[in-house]
Amino acid sequence: IPAPSIRLVPPYPSSQEDPIHIACMAPGNFPGANFTLYRGGQVVQLLQAPTDQRGVTFNLSGGSSKAPGGPFHCQYGVLGELNQSQLSDLSEPVNVSFPVPTW
């Protein structure tokens, strides 16, 4: 099943203490999927989309950018034919960067 799309959504973090908002979207024919957000190979958060929606927005509290390292990816799972679980591939990576202080 196709990989989801992923993107940072406003307000964008300006420091490591700011919350991070990441939207993950499945293709149109997979509403109500279970979404996983990864960083550094491990799970950061799980969310299920409402049955009439194709995606979710992960809201990570301040400090989430500190560990584990690496870019964020998301993935979704659905129940396919005969109630068999299916998993998408990973999304493209999304990196979170912060403005360089001018002082």
Epitope: G41, Q42, H73, G77, Q86, L87, D89, L90, E92
Partner: antibody, heavy 117, light 116 residues
Framework: EVQLVESGGGVVQPGRSLRLSCAAS????????MHWVRQAPGKGPEWLGI????????VYADSVRGRLTISRDNSKNTLYLQMDSLRDEDTAVYYC??????????WGQGTMVTVSS | QAVLTQPASLSASPGASASLTCTLR?????????IYWYQQKPGSPPQYLLR?????????GSGVPSRFSGSKDASANAGILLISGLQSEDEADYYC?????????FGGGTQLTVLG
């Protein structure tokens, strides 16, 4: 240090059942998907299935769906593989592997299962 | 036809480079896949080396030397594992792997021999 230790292998007759265990340590077990992979003598690895962190989502390879059941107990840091209706072609070394995203990076040393009458 | 095809064997000299290929079946576009590579030595489980999709989406395994690198050959519809500065300890079986149709699929493996 990440450690995975499989157990429960041995010689079993065709048609019988076997349950393998994988004891995990050195990482936050509940934050990672886990896999079972097998390797028949002289052959390449064959992926059997993945169970996600919370245990509610399991995906199996077509070749074993219906005969194998993967489960986990996060309170015991343990992964399980229940194998039913065993066949000669199930003879292999069975590895558990730690999830890396939904792939896997670290493997255990494996446990040998021999199906023979 | 297998999903992933690897040459059964490859030989190279110490200090040289070895290019191991993993060809995807016709109709499966290598550009859309992350290709994972594992090394296996006799009597040991496979060890994760790296994954490669593009230069902006790649990941080196923990402790894996930089002389192991991934790339793709779009014209051949293949993933490539490049090992530079070959050493005797690189002699092993190498497997590629992709996530295809909601399952992990391995190639048949390449046995790399380091001559001398």
């Amino acid at each position: 240090e990440v450690q995975l230790v499989e157990s429960g292998g041995g010689v079993v007759q065709p048609g019988r059942s076997l349950r393998l265990s994988c004891a995990a340590s050195g990482f936050t077990f509940s934050s990672f998907a886990m896999h079972w992979v097998r390797q028949a003598p002289g052959k390449g690895p064959e992926w059997l299935g993945i169970i996600l962190y919370e245990g509610g989502h399991v995906v199996y390879a077509d070749s074993v769906r219906g005969r194998l059941t993967i489960s986990r107990d996060n309170s015991k840091n343990t992964l399980y593989l229940q194998m039913d209706s065993l066949r000669d072609e199930d003879t292999a070394v069975y590895y558990c592997a730690k999830g890396f995203y939904h792939a896997f990076d670290v493997w255990g040393q494996g446990t040998m299962v021999t199906v023979s009458s | 036809q297998a999903v992933l095809t690897q040459p059964a064997s490859l030989s190279a000299s110490p200090g040289a480079s070895a290019s191991l290929t993993c060809t995807l079946r016709s109709g499966i576009n290598v550009g859309t896949y992350r290709i994972y590579w594992y090394q296996q030595k006799p009597g040991s489980p496979p060890q994760y080396l790296l994954r490669y999709k593009s230069d902006s989406d790649k990941q080196q395994g923990s402790g894996v030397p930089s002389r192991f690198s991934g790339s793709k050959d779009a014209s051949a519809n293949a993933g490539i594992l490049l090992i530079s500065g070959l050493q005797s300890e690189d002699e092993a079986d190498y497997y590629c792997m992709i996530w295809h149709s909601s399952a992990w699929v391995f190639g048949g493996g390449t046995q790399l021999t380091v001559l001398g």
